[in-house]
Interface confidence: medium
């Protein structure tokens, strides 16, 4: 049986979780993507999603979450900026491709955010907004009211996740270096 595992990431308040989820280009480039949290004893909750159809390199920001879908690279980038202790939890990246149930793109991420010095103003939202180079043309997208059931079972590819602090400008360089071969076929 193929059981999905968790990848643990321990970060400090004020830091950024930077996750790159790769997917099969031909199949899922324009499919809507979403970032979800799963709390113990609860169902998955969608925190943010791309537009439908998903637009290439077009940032979508919901609060402190920024999604960018790079069609050319088959890569969804998820950033959670100015992390807070309350952000700790289990997350997953999924693809909506009606009429199928969401595909999970990678092992779930167990995010642990702790208080501590990260070399930044930390929990002050206003001060970090000035440091981050978040594109001004962000769009809020409405997540789907529903998706239809999955009719096939597919194994998920891995993700890569990077950690950055508000000192560093967010950019996407050497993307080809971080893409792993997807399991989708």
């Amino acid at each position: 049986a193929t059981k999905l595992t968790e990848e643990k990431y321990e970060l400090k308040e004020g830091q950024t979780l930077d996750v790159k989820c790769d997917y099969t280009l031909e199949k899922f480039a324009s499919s809507q993507k979403a970032w979800q949290i799963i709390r113990d004893g609860e169902m998955p909750k969608t925190l943010a999603c791309t537009e439908r159809p998903s637009k290439n390199s077009h940032p979508v920001q919901v609060g402190r979450i920024i999604l960018e879908d790079y069609h050319d690279h088959g890569l969804l980038r998820v950033r959670m900026v100015n992390l807070q202790v309350e952000d700790s939890g289990l997350y997953q990246c999924v693809i909506y491709q009606p009429p199928k149930e969401p595909h999970m793109l990678f092992d779930r991420i167990r995010l642990v955010v702790t208080k501590g010095f990260s070399g930044t103003p930390g929990s002050n939202e206003n001060s970090t907004q000035n440091v981050y180079k978040i594109p001004p043309t962000t769009t809020k997208a409405l997540c789907p009211l529903y998706t239809s059931p999955r009719t096939v079972t597919q194994a998920p590819p891995k993700s890569t996740a990077d950690v950055s602090t508000p000192d560093s400008e967010i950019n996407l360089t050497n993307v080809t270096d971080i893409i792993r071969v997807p399991v989708f076929n």
């Epitope: 049986a1 113990d40 998955p44 999970m104 529903y146 998706t147 059931p149 079972t153």
Partner: antibody, heavy 122, light 108 residues
Framework: QVQLQESGPGLVKPSETLSLTCTVS????????WTWIRQPPGKGLEWIGY???????NYNPSLKSRVTLSIDTSKNQFSLKLSSVTAADTAVYYC????????????????WGQGTLVTVSS | EIVLTQSPGTLSLSPGERATLSCRAS???????LAWYQQKPGQAPRLLIY???SRATGIPERFSGSGSGTDFTLTISRLEPEDFAVYYC?????????FGGGTKVEIK
Amino acid sequence: QVQLQESGPGLVKPSETLSLTCTVSGGSITNYYWTWIRQPPGKGLEWIGYIYDSGYTNYNPSLKSRVTLSIDTSKNQFSLKLSSVTAADTAVYYCARGVLWFGELLPLLDYWGQGTLVTVSS
Amino acid sequence: EIVLTQSPGTLSLSPGERATLSCRASQSVSSSYLAWYQQKPGQAPRLLIYGASSRATGIPERFSGSGSGTDFTLTISRLEPEDFAVYYCQQYGSSPLTFGGGTKVEIK
């Protein structure tokens, strides 16, 4: 191909607790809604409840007071316990995999086990 | 809860004929969250149709579903010998999840 297999005692005494386990193979237990359904001999199907891998449960109100579902993701198994059974609980018990519409509470059942007959009798 | 009433209880037809099965809900089924299952003796139910009209993977084109609200239909355009079984409708739009009483399609 996803396969589900129910296991547990075929005979349970009245007032005791019925315990069944479903083992999932050929697929992940993560991100699905694992469901129990029963079918009394010669009758229709009745939904018992489901459990998600986070431990979230949803039960049929008619059975809620007697039902407990649990899940062990490390073993790819989920289980059903039905307490204070009577002859009316005699049925074929099925486990099934559920997929869920976003924002909804009830899953569609796309893969089923073969079922196991549980008889309640002294 | 939503009560699903299937009719007829038994349908006697010959191979090659068209079968029309009805499922009526006591109240509207939200977003057409209605499914059809086929069950043969000693076997588990098999998903045929979901979302009232979408065929599940591997289901032949002769099976089709239609309807919305409270009235739904499963049609088997041309019965094959392996199609003789019991068919159940199921709604999953409102708790609790419920099934119809079933329609038995038997060989005439």
